[in-house]
Interface confidence: medium
């Protein structure tokens, strides 16, 4: 049988068994995560687990804007450079931009500098756009 694509919430986009919502709103990292969770379905700030997933997301976001960074679900809660995905996914795929990750920067964003394909760390209280993800 043909595998049918599950439906996502209105306005969310589907890729490989997941639904993604790009919120063009300004939230700090923890408020963004709370807003993602408020949509139910186990939604969290997005984990990005492969280059294929990163490329699909980057292409989608570039259709809206190319200049503003976007929060994702990667953070360093113990502030010891021990990064983890908020949805519990394994931290295997990495796409850091190579910039220094020092200072008080314990939350990760998709950087606009490389068309959203690479990540940078930033201060978690910055208010930025954000990307949510859930499995329908």
């Amino acid at each position: 049988d043909i595998i049918m694509r599950p439906s996502c919430a209105p306005g969310w986009f589907y890729h490989k068994s997941n639904c993604y919502g790009y919120f063009r709103k300004l939230r700090n990292w923890s408020d963004a995560e709370l807003e993602c969770q408020s949509y139910g379905n186990g939604a969290h700030l997005a984990s990005i687990l492969s280059l294929k997933e990163a490329s699909t997301i980057a292409e989608y976001i570039s259709g809206y804007q190319r200049s503003q960074p976007i929060w994702i679900g990667l953070h360093d809660p113990q502030k010891r450079q021990q990064w983890q995905w908020i949805d519990g996914a394994m931290y295997l795929y990495r796409s850091w931009s190579g910039k220094s990750m020092g200072g008080n920067k314990h939350c990760a964003e998709m950087s606009s500098n490389n068309n959203f394909l690479t990540w940078s760390s930033n201060e978690c209280n910055k208010r930025q756009h954000f990307l949510c993800k859930y499995r329908p």
């Epitope: 209105p10 306005g11 969310w12 919502g21 790009y22 919120f23 063009r24 709103k25 300004l26 949509y39």
Partner: antibody, heavy 119, light 109 residues
Framework: QVQLVQSGAEVKKPGASVKVSCKAA????????LHWLRQVPGQGPEWMGW????????NYGEKFQGRVTMTRDRPSSTAYMEIKSLRVDDTAVYYC????????????WGRGTLVTVSS | FMLTQPHSVSESPGKTVTISCTRS????????VQWYQQRPGSAPTTLIY?????PSGVPDRFSGSIDSSSNSASLTISNLKTEDEADYYC?????????FGTGTKLTVL
Amino acid sequence: QVQLVQSGAEVKKPGASVKVSCKAAGFRFSGDYLHWLRQVPGQGPEWMGWINLSSGGTNYGEKFQGRVTMTRDRPSSTAYMEIKSLRVDDTAVYYCARESPVVEAMDVWGRGTLVTVSS
Amino acid sequence: FMLTQPHSVSESPGKTVTISCTRSSDNIAFNYVQWYQQRPGSAPTTLIYEDNQRPSGVPDRFSGSIDSSSNSASLTISNLKTEDEADYYCQSYDGSNYVFGTGTKLTVL
């Protein structure tokens, strides 16, 4: 006190141009965005575009591209909006409004400039 | 996209009224919604920004909310006063264009 002071009412003939000014007082004329909107009597506001007061960069609404020019003069803290090839249906109150530097909202509005286009 | 509001609503002083704002396409939650009040002959003033935040000076009788299931935003005014009689506009954004709602005239009977 933060305010935007707009130029006075104008009466123009179809085909003419008009330039409305908006002078900022009480805030730094720097990285903020200044929006221009218009409102036909009895209708809702219609967004025309914005200008970045720092860089001078602009973003025009599709409907107004090619006919509207937004500029700013930093020394005098004044922004300008010019419409060319005026039509009768351009008759409206034109507002400038500052986008808050902190949140995504237009927090300070000018009092409006009535532009009447009539033959 | 369009933001559609009821043309008019009316209610008595002391009561509560809710004005809806339905987005025609895309998810209402993906961009902030603002609400503006406009009295005759005056410029609009901000009542609610970023979905549900009130500027200082706006009474807590005014509140904003978002409902993704109906793809709409709502402005609720409780304990209505005669000075609340005005036009109310919602406003949102699509990445390049700022769009205002069709407007609702509130009459306080």
